[in-house]
Amino acid sequence: YSHWPSCCPSKGQDTSEELLRWSTVPVPPLEPARPNRHPESCRASEDGPLNSRAISPWRYELDRDLNRLPQDLYHARCLCPHCVSLQTGSHMDPRGNSELLYHNQTVFYRRPCHGEKGTHKGYCLERRLYRVSLACVCVRPRVMG
Amino acid sequence: YSHWPSCCPSKGQDTSEELLRWSTVPVPPLEPARPNRHPESCRASEDGPLNSRAISPWRYELDRDLNRLPQDLYHARCLCPHCVSLQTGSHMDPRGNSELLYHNQTVFYRRPCHGEKGTHKGYCLERRLYRVSLACVCVRPRVMG
């Protein structure tokens, strides 16, 4: 995995200033979910990683931003709209929906730091919330009251 | 969320040293549902948050460490060994297992920084991988070949 060697300003800068500026503005994912182009993947395997054995199977899509920490995030993408039957592992069961589990993840964006007179003094990290989908979960549909 | 105002050492330290090594893994939900204290919670609700509507329902347990970033992590705990029937929402279906989705999450521990002569110069962040469970997923059991 990649890393940044330092979150600190350039050599010699007064490091007592607040380098991590914290805010809580959610940022949407860069790549919206696209329908899966491979219909044959809507099945629950009897082997392999958990995301392929799930009856709400999913794949991961890479989202890379070189000015963000983490630089690489992965968004889950559901392979089926409904859950796969436990019996067959292939047919869909319309009684269950395959839903994304979302999470607002804390990320840090690298921004230029500015000194007392507005001069550029290294980089600061700005905290943001960034929405990622972690997995697909088989749920009972909501009953509207 | 509390925060540390700076991830850098105290004034005057050479900040060109490598303070942070960053990895690229997702973080579990910030605001999970509170743990359900009732044993009848091994059921899939038709309402409420995703973790209670799932046929592999789970609760979250808080893990707080004030010398770690993030300070609060949440671990998913499965409420049923098997998946809940989509038909009834309560009876378990032994054809499916409720399995934890694990992730090695990058966290940072606050450690004292030491200057050239071993003097304490502020705090540095030490990167570690920390295993968290994100959710419970209904899967087909592995077939042993």
Epitope: H3, Y60, L62 | -
Partner: antibody, heavy 121, light 107 residues
């Protein structure tokens, strides 16, 4: 010693599919993303996509309009490229290439397979 | 997609010459640029990463510079074994894109 060994040359009819394999050795397969790059005769290198063996995470070049599927078999330390709906312009050499990183500055393809020639005619 | 344009497309130089190849990006890519060398009939090899960092085992006669949209690969003293096609590649955004290549020959 890091090595990427690709499968042999293929000749395919238009409309068919091809699946190329790339067996890795000499490093931790799950620790590095794998890129796939195509070189048509006399043309520039063209990036097709990458896959992270750790979680199967992918990024595709949308210019291939969904015809590309990347997969891995971590137990065999092997990456696969599948290209379907083949046409004559898909003729070329297909390379797998490991993506290394050094710091936040660096994503680069440091080891390449020997290439697999795919001919569509 | 970010377009990468190299110039010249081909060049011929004598052993010992200083050779310069340029690469231009259609938009700013900071310093997120790699250079690859592909000898005739061979596989591409990483030469320089992050604009100016020499990959391990690459002779010091190779160097890179630039930032933003304009980049340069320089060979300070051309050697016979440097006959190859050289490609630049940006990695700030997906899809990664390569230049069309510069074919270098010995006079």
């Amino acid at each position: 010693e890091v090595q990427l060994v690709e499968s042999g040359a293929e000749v395919k009819k238009p409309g068919a599919s091809v699946k190329v394999s790339c067996k890795a050795s000499g490093y931790s397969f799950s620790g590095y993303t794998m890129n796939w790059v195509r070189q048509a005769p006399g043309q520039r290198l063209e990036w097709m996509g990458l896959i992270n063996p750790y979680n199967g995470g992918t990024s595709y070049n949308q210019n291939f309009k969904g015809r590309v599927t990347l997969t891995v078999d971590t137990s065999a330390s092997t990456a696969y490229l599948e290209l379907n709906s083949l046409r004559s312009e898909d003729t070329g050499v297909y390379y797998c290439a490991r993506e290394d990183f050094d710091s936040w500055t660096y994503f680069a393809m440091d080891y390449w397979g020997q290439g697999t020639l795919v001919t569509v005619s | 997609d970010i377009q990468m344009t190299q110039s010249p497309s081909s060049l011929s130089a004598s052993v010992g010459d200083r050779v310069t190849i340029t690469c231009s990006a259609s938009q700013g890519i900071n310093e997120y640029l790699n250079w690859y060398q592909q000898k005739p009939g061979k596989v591409p090899k990483l030469l320089i990463y992050y604009t100016s960092s020499l990959h391990s085992g690459v002779p010091s006669r190779f160097s890179g510079s630039g930032s933003g949209t304009d980049f340069t690969l320089t060979i300070s003293s051309l050697q016979p074994e440097d006959v190859a096609t050289y490609y630049c590649q940006q990695y700030i955004n997906f899809p990664y894109t390569f230049g069309q290549g510069t074919k270098l020959e010995i006079k």
